[in-house]
């Protein structure tokens, strides 16, 4: 008996071939001997089966001695043995229809679990293997689960169902809802305008939800909410914003926040959360602000940074085009009695400059100029 695997919702063609290459009488029946379809001369005739409106054949192939049964919009319950009667002989085809669906929604938050469930006909014992977009293979029976979805899991999952040495392939598009970056650091000189951007790693037709940016300033004992906002069909509207600092927010995606001035009291870490409509859980992105200040007070030239810096970052003070006068893995460095000229304060990571501030030291009889 020939075995054919089909996919729920798909169309399948069951073939039946006669030795004579011409149109002759044929009938297709199910295992209960109920007629599905056949021919009467050149006309297609249909029987009383439950497939009536979903069964078809191809007239143009009859003249070649081919009498296919085509079943559209396959259902699991279409799984059956189908019998083609032609030229006093019977051809049997066993059709097995499978379905593979994602647990609830195919749009899942980062960190959530994906469960794929296989629908299969009674008496079948299929095996399933799925391959994620990043090439990870998972195997299982009726259900397959992947916990802790990551951004790289977004895309097409290809699942192969094996039964009777035959296979059928399913493709499921999964969208992991997340920000493009889990964390980002912005380095700014005191007084500069700060731009925070929170690009999403997915695109959907309509995006509705609400969000908030909580900020933990390095100098503050507790965190506070800097801004709350709503998102409706990709349009952003601010609900509430603190007076200090007075953040501004872009009206369109990607989410964009502007801090008018980088000041030491703002240096610290923020957590932007976004709750999407009809989704349990929230999207998170951490953002960090590091602020640098270079000052000269009497005979002391000082460079300081505030905010979350890693211990391996180097803070240096150097006279332009000269070797660093002082270089430390600390958040403040200074030079006593600095010589006149343009001094540079540099925050660097393995030789790569992250932030620099220049200060002009004038001869001792005059006051310093900050460019």
């Amino acid at each position: 008996k020939k075995v054919v695997l089909g996919k729920k919702g798909d169309t399948v063609e069951l073939t039946c071939t006669a030795s004579q290459k011409k149109s002759i009488q044929f009938h297709w029946k199910n295992s209960n001997q109920i007629k599905i379809l056949g021919n009467q001369g050149s006309f297609l005739t249909k029987g009383p089966s439950k497939l009536n409106d979903r069964a078809d054949s191809r007239r143009s192939l009859w003249d070649q001695g081919n009498f296919p049964l085509i079943i559209k919009n396959l259902k699991i319950e279409d799984s059956d043995t189908y019998i083609c009667e032609v030229e006093d002989q019977k051809e049997e085809v066993q059709l097995l229809v499978f379905g593979l669906t994602a647990n609830s929604d195919t749009h899942l938050l980062q960190g959530q679990s994906l469960t794929l469930t296989l629908e299969s006909p009674p008496g079948s014992s299929p095996s399933v293997q799925c391959r994620s977009p990043r090439g990870k293979n998972i195997q299982g029976g009726k259900t397959l689960s992947v916990s802790q979805l990551e951004l790289q899991d977004s895309g097409t999952w290809t699942c192969t169902v094996l039964q009777n040495q035959k296979k059928v392939e399913f493709k499921i598009d999964i969208v992991v809802l997340a920000f493009q970056k889990a964390s980002s650091i912005v380095y700014k000189k005191e007084g500069e305008q700060v731009e925070f951007s929170f690009p999403l790693a997915f695109t959907v037709e309509k995006l509705t939800g609400s969000g908030e940016l909580w900020w933990q300033a390095e100098r503050a004992s507790s965190s506070k909410s800097w801004i709350t906002f709503d998102l409706k069909n990709k349009e952003v509207s601010v609900k509430r914003v603190t007076q200090d600092p007075k953040l501004q927010m872009g009206k369109k995606l990607p989410l964009h926040l502007t801090l008018p001035q980088a000041l030491p009291q703002y240096a610290g870490s923020g957590n932007l959360t976004l709750a999407l409509e009809a989704k349990t859980g929230k999207l998170h992105q951490e953002v960090n602000l590091v602020v640098m200040r270079a000052t000269q007070l009497q005979k002391n030239l000082t460079c300081e940074v505030w905010g979350p810096t890693s211990p391996k970052l180097m803070l240096s003070l150097k006279l332009e085009n000269k070797e660093a006068k002082v270089s430390k893995r600390e958040k403040a460095v200074w030079v006593l009695n600095p010589e006149a000229g343009m001094w540079q304060c540099l925050l660097s990571d393995s030789g790569q400059v992250l932030l620099e501030s220049n200060i002009k030291v004038l001869p001792t009889w005059s006051t310093p100029v900050q460019p």
């Epitope: 798909d10 169309t11 399948v12 063609e13 050149s42 006309f43 007239r59 143009s60 559209k72």
Partner: antibody
């Protein structure tokens, strides 16, 4: 809902080979045949040929010697190759799904053969 | 090959009119016939299949009849959007063939 998107070169010189590809979205290739049809002011609508998921083909005898239709099931795509084109092959080429009737259709690609 | 002949090649009518288009096959094709509508710059659209079955989403003012060699497409009450070219197609045998079309124009 199945949609067909087609592409390929629109301007050819005589004796060159016409190549068009059609991608199936919102469904799979299984169970149906997938056809190419062309339409020119002189000849009207002309069926070129068809292919199914297994690669089984049927061609119009008038074009059979120059036509190859192929299928790429991994991409849900099928393609048309027509060799040794002449000005008479200038037409709008459509890809379409078929059991006995043609539905749906691609948007069509105008192919002009000119020296 | 089976030849499909449509008549008339063009017809003028007004909104609200009842219009009948005909298609003749050069040999018996039972009911293996479809009708398509095509508007300028667009692909043909399936209206009727198996001679008389209305394709899903097609307005009920369209109807088809016939069997064997003679077939008709009737539009019971013409609407502005119905002005187009109509083609018949046989699916009885390879190669599939189409009629040359009937252009339905506004009077």
């Amino acid at each position: 809902q199945v949609q067909l998107q087609q592409w390929g070169a629109g301007l050819l010189k005589p004796s060159e080979t016409l190549s068009l590809t059609c991608a199936v979205y919102g469904g799979s290739l299984s169970g149906y045949y997938w056809s190419w049809i062309r339409q020119s002011p002189g000849k009207g609508l002309e069926w070129i040929g068809e292919i199914n998921q297994s690669g089984s083909t049927n061609y119009n005898p008038s074009l059979k010697s120059r036509v190859t239709i192929s299928v790429d099931t991994s991409k849900d795509q099928f393609s048309l190759r027509l060799t040794s084109v002449t000005a008479a092959d200038t037409a709008v080429y459509y890809c379409t799904r078929v059991l006995n009737w043609f539905d749906p259709w691609g948007r069509g690609t105008l192919v002009t053969v000119s020296s | 090959d089976i030849q499909m002949t449509q008549s008339p090649s063009s017809v003028s009518a007004s909104v609200g009119d009842r219009v009948t288009l005909t298609c003749r096959a050069s040999q018996d094709i039972s009911n293996w016939l479809a009708w398509y509508q095509q508007k300028p710059g667009k692909a043909p659209k399936l209206l009727i299949y198996a001679a008389s079955s209305l394709q899903s989403g097609v307005p009920s003012r369209f109807s088809g009849s016939g069997s064997g060699t003679d077939f008709t497409l009737t539009i019971s009450s013409l609407q502005t959007e119905d002005f187009a070219t109509y083609y018949c197609q046989q699916a009885n045998s390879f190669p599939y063939t189409f009629g040359q079309g009937t252009k339905l124009e506004i009077k």
